[in-house]
């Protein structure tokens, strides 16, 4: 396991000023669970680094991940409603460097590491379907969400909008 | 423009059920969360509960056991539904929509002009 | 549930005077706090969302600072129509908690 040190939740820097030339309106060191409380959990196995949903022992150490908050403008002739509307995007960063991304083609949630500015794949649009319990859906795809298959996560298609609540698109935050 | 319009009657006996409507317009309530608000007489706001774009509500803790919060996508409506009402459910009843697209995270930037609702028999 | 402080609960002010009303959290919220002025009849506005960032059509001399559980809303220099009642609200967790109001009066 591994997370970012000496880094306190909210009160950080702010690393690098710009990304996709906007920069986060809030960052949040915030270890990631299932809605079933299971550990979202990295670890660097031959040079790469895998990404694990599991049951931690008492008193282990949850990761933590680095969440970056952006705030995006979703013009009028995308939205449907005729006004332009803003989104919250995010995105996740486990150790320095290295950045959740979206592998749409292989339907796969992988840790890459990368350069500012980050690429599309690398931000998920945030939604509070559930109370206390957010959904990360890919920018790159939309309808598609970060969810757990077979304990890894993966990349999920949500067919309506009934189903966004389904429990296996869902993350809780905790700063503990 | 996006609008938030809240309807019912003004006054309700207590014990009975409290009902009112929120249509909205310029806006899809599939992408974006609406909420219930009130404001006693010379008091401060109480948020009530919610009714989020993918269908979950969230709820007050204090007013969970009588409060249900729905919707009819084809008519772009949000009802409240109060239960066992008492003269402490007296106030002015706001909807209110989320700032942002499918999260409460920014606070809510359009409201309603909201309904008094007096409990009395 | 996490309760919202606010302080003062009235505060006496001349035009062009700074005005501070603070805000705080009963656990920590992160930067998931906005602020409401409230004029009476009229519904609330929003003024300040994710605890720094300026509404559309809110003039500057509103500004939001703080994170965590402390939190602050200044007026730089207040205006005649800025005598209202303003609220704080922390949407970091459902549910969505309001502060109990100040009001700023004509001194």
């Known amino acids: 396991a591994f997370g970012i040190s000496g880094v306190q939740k909210y009160t950080r820097a702010l690393h690098d000023s710009s990304i996709t030339g906007i920069s986060p309106i809030t960052e949040y060191l915030a270890s990631l669970s299932t809605y079933n409380d299971q550990s979202i959990t990295f670890a660097l196995e031959d040079e790469s680094y895998e990404i694990y949903v599991e049951d931690l022992k008492k008193d282990e150490k949850k990761d933590k991940v680095l969440l970056s908050y952006y705030e995006s403008q979703h013009p009028s002739n995308e939205s449907g409603d005729g006004v332009d509307g803003k989104m919250l995007m995010v995105t996740l960063s486990p150790t320095k460097d290295f950045w959740l991304h979206a592998n749409n083609k292989e339907h796969s949630v992988e840790l890459h590491k990368c350069e500012k500015p980050l690429p599309d794949q690398a931000f998920f649009v945030l939604h509070n379907m559930h109370s206390n319990c957010v959904s990360f859906e890919c920018k790159t795809d939309p309808g598609v969400f970060i969810g757990v298959k077979d304990n890894h996560l993966a990349l999920i298609k949500v067919d309506s909008s009934e189903n966004l609540c389904t429990e296996n698109i869902l993350f809780k935050l905790s700063e503990t | 423009q996006v609008q938030l319009q809240e309807s019912g009657p003004g006054l309700v006996k207590p014990s009975e059920t409290l009902s009112l409507t929120c249509t909205v317009s310029?806006?899809?309530?599939?992408?974006?969360?609406v909420h219930w608000i009130r404001q006693p007489p010379g008091k401060g706001l109480e948020w009530i509960g919610v009714l989020r774009a993918g269908g979950s509500t969230g709820y007050n803790s204090a007013l969970m056991s009588r409060v249900t919060i729905s919707k009819d996508t084809s008519k772009s409506q949000v009802s409240l539904k109060l239960s066992s009402v008492t003269a402490a459910d007296t106030a002015v009843y706001y909807c209110?929509?989320?700032?942002?697209?499918?999260?409460?995270?920014?606070?809510?930037?359009?409201w309603g002009q909201g309904t008094l609702v007096t409990v009395s028999s | 549930d996490i309760q919202m402080t606010q302080s003062p609960s009235s505060v006496s002010a001349s035009v062009g005077d700074r005005v501070t009303i603070t805000c705080l959290a009963s656990?920590?919220?992160?930067?998931?706090l906005a602020w409401y002025q409230q004029k009476p009849g009229k519904s609330p506005k929003l003024l300040i969302y994710a605890a720094t960032r300026l509404a559309d059509g809110v003039p500057s001399r509103f500004s939001g600072s703080g994170s965590g559980t402390d939190f602050t809303l200044t007026i730089s220099s207040l205006q005649p129509e800025d005598f209202a009642t303003y609220y704080c609200?922390?949407?970091?967790?459902?549910?969505?908690?309001f502060g109990q109001g100040t009001k700023v009066e004509i001194k």
């Open positions: 609200q922390q949407l970091d967790s459902s549910p969505y908690t």
């Open positions: 656990q920590t919220i992160g930067a998931w």
């Open positions: 310029g806006f899809s309530l599939s992408k974006y969360g």
């Open positions: 209110a929509r989320d700032h942002y697209y499918y999260s409460s995270y920014g606070g809510f930037v359009y």
